[in-house]
Structures are given as C-alpha cells and as structure tokens.
C-alpha cells in the first residue's frame, strides 16, 4: 500500500561490490520510517527473493550471502506503521572473483518512470 | 502493550493438517512481522517462518518448504499458521511471535502463549 | 539457509563460574543476532540482541560479543537464576534460524 501521506524515499546506491556481498546506500527523510523493507532477487531465477528489514534510523547495510558474477535486483521500501512507500530499485552485478572486489560496477536505480545511471 | 493470543490445543491424525490463529491486540499489525516458532517436547526451538502483514508475502525455513503456510488477515489482526501432512514428530508447541530484527525494532519481543498440537493415531 | 551451530550442546557450572556460549553462522551474516534463555514450561527471553545490546532488565553479567559468523554470550559470574537453556537467534537475512541450544545444569 502507498499513499500521499509517506514521504518517499530519495535514491539509491551500490556503494561497494564483492563476489558475495554488497553494501547499499540510501536517502530517506529522517524519522520518517519505522523500518526499511529491502528484496534481493536473483535476476532471471524464478528463486524467492531474499527479504530483510533494517531499522529506520540507518541508511546503509551490508548485503552477504550473495553469489559471485550474478545480476541482482535490489529493491528497497520505508515502511511506516500503516503504509509502504513506492518501490526503488537498483541493479547489480556482483564482482567475479577477489581481484574485482569493489571495483565499479553500472547501477540503475528507478522509482516510477524515473531512470538513472551511475557510473 | 503487545498481546499475542493463540488459538488452543488441537489432537490431529497423521496425514492431517492443522492450522493455529494467532491474534495481535495493543498496537499496530499490518507494519511489523510474525513468526512462527515450534518446540518440540525436550527439543530445541525452531524458527518455521514468518510473513509482514503490509506486504503479505512469507518466508520459510527450508525444512517445511512446502508444508506449512502463513497468511495474515489485516481486518481481523490474525495471523495462521497451517501445516500440512502431519506427523508425529510434529507433535510440539508451536508460538506465533513478533520477534526482533525481522520488520520489528522495539524494545521488547511478544510470543503468544503457545499452542500444543499432538500427532497421533 | 544459514545455520547456527551452537557449542557446547550442555555444560556444567557452578554458581559464581564465568560461562561462554558460542554460536557460529554458516556465512556472514548482518549482527541481527538475539540471544535468548528458556525455562521450562516458559516461553523464551531475549536476553541481548544486535550481537552485544542488553535487553533492558537484564542483569549486567550477562554480556553478548563477535561479529560476522561467530557470537558469543557471557554470563560473568553465574547465579542460582541462571541455570536454563540459552539459544542464539540469527534473524537479521530471512529465513532466521535458531542454534541448537545450550543448556547449563548445575555442577
């Protein structure tokens, strides 16, 4: 459910890549959630996507237990005690061995019909 | 102040299914998780699943992929726990809680206060 | 899914003893990780949660330590209260998982 009321997020990024974890950034109004909702999905796997939550005062977290060399869909909601937040999402990479390790990678974060490449 | 009231004991026949409500009272429902956590009798506790109500999607423990279904009614604050082909070694308590770090941040868990499902011919 | 291997299974002690219950992940895990105590007949208590915050109530000697895969909980001078069961909760990437429980009997 999303509504006019919740304040929607700001953007997203991949701040570091691995070949098995990520750290994601984000920005959001302060205190205006109670938690942040984020799904990992594998792209072009029909695999459940992996849910976490993250507590609404931080704007970063490490994702582990992620496969080397694979694209991953990252989306990320604030929830509030009665609504949800549109969805933004960013695409990943993960790097394919230990050299790669927090080298650069393309993300692509979207809300709605908005579009952005970082570099 | 966080209730958790479960629905009561249940006697089931291998094959069966059976399914436990757990109603949320004295806060908000749809926002933060439940878990469903079973005990079997002088065993472990072992973390079933669990599903946010806002988003109505529930995760499983892989060893009851498959068997067991969590949903949650937002009208009524309820969440269920169903688990299917039953068993003996089902026969356990099984406790729907709001447990930290899943979708929940306060500074106290909630458990209900347990439901005994007995698996017998 | 992750798992937590929890160690030992049972110990001894005696009151006044310092104990240390380790739980180690199957991989890095996010430090959403909640130790809790049992009694029978009761339904568990969180004791610490975050790896190493004390749940409010909790007396000081319990203590919670480690990151990444492995945990610790310390209990600095054992009291007559304390002898139960302690598992450790990962609950911070989905599906959680409980360790197997440790359970400390009196010596």
């Known amino acids: 459910a999303s509504t006019g009321e919740t304040p929607n997020l700001g953007e997203v990024v991949v701040a570091e890549v691995g070949w098995d974890a990520l750290k994601l950034n984000w920005t959001a109004p302060e205190g205006a959630y109670e938690y942040f909702f984020i799904q990992v999905q594998e792209a072009d796997t029909v695999e459940a996507a992996q849910n976490l939550t993250v507590p609404g005062g931080l704007r970063s977290t490490d994702l582990p237990g992620l496969k080397a060399a694979t694209h991953y869909t990252i989306t990320i909601r604030g929830v509030t005690q009665d609504f949800s937040t549109t969805p933004l999402s960013v695409e990943v990479l993960t790097a394919s061995g230990l050299n790669d390790i927090f080298e650069a990678q393309k993300i692509e974060w979207h809300e709605g019909t908005h579009h952005h490449h970082h570099h | 102040q966080v209730q958790l009231v479960q629905s009561g004991a249940e006697v089931k026949k291998p094959g069966s299914s059976v399914k436990v409500s757990c109603k949320a009272s004295?806060?908000?429902?749809?926002?933060?998780?439940i878990s469903w956590v079973r005990q079997a009798p002088g065993q472990g506790l072992e973390w079933m699943g669990g599903?946010?109500?806002?988003?109505?999607?529930?995760n499983y423990a892989q060893k009851f992929q498959g068997r067991v279904t969590i949903t949650a009614d937002k009208s009524t604050s309820t969440a269920y726990m169903e688990l299917s082909s039953l068993r003996s070694e089902d026969t356990a308590v099984y406790y729907c809680?709001?447990?930290?770090?899943?979708?929940?941040?306060?500074?106290?868990?909630?458990w209900g206060q347990g439901t005994t499902v007995t698996v017998s011919s | 899914d992750i798992q937590m291997t929890q160690s030992p299974s049972s110990l001894s002690a005696s009151v006044g003893d310092r104990v240390t219950i380790t739980c180690r992940a199957s991989?890095?895990?996010?430090?959403?990780l909640g130790w809790y105590q049992q009694k029978p007949g009761k339904a568990p208590k969180r004791l610490i949660y975050?790896?190493?915050s004390l749940q409010s109530g909790v007396p000081s000697r319990f203590s919670g330590g480690g990151s990444g895969t492995e945990f610790t909980l310390t209990i600095s001078s054992l009291q007559p209260e304390d002898f139960a069961t302690y598992y450790c909760?990962?609950?911070?990437?989905?599906?959680?998982?409980f360790g197997q429980g440790t359970k400390v009997e009196i010596k």
């Open positions: 809680a709001r447990l930290y770090g899943y979708a929940y941040y306060g500074a106290f868990d909630y």
């Open positions: 599903i946010i109500p806002i988003f109505g999607t529930a």
């Open positions: 975050d790896a190493y």
């Open positions: 909760l990962q609950n911070g990437l989905q599906p959680a998982t």
């Open positions: 991989q890095g895990i996010r430090n959403v």
């Open positions: 004295g806060g908000t429902f749809s926002s933060y998780a």
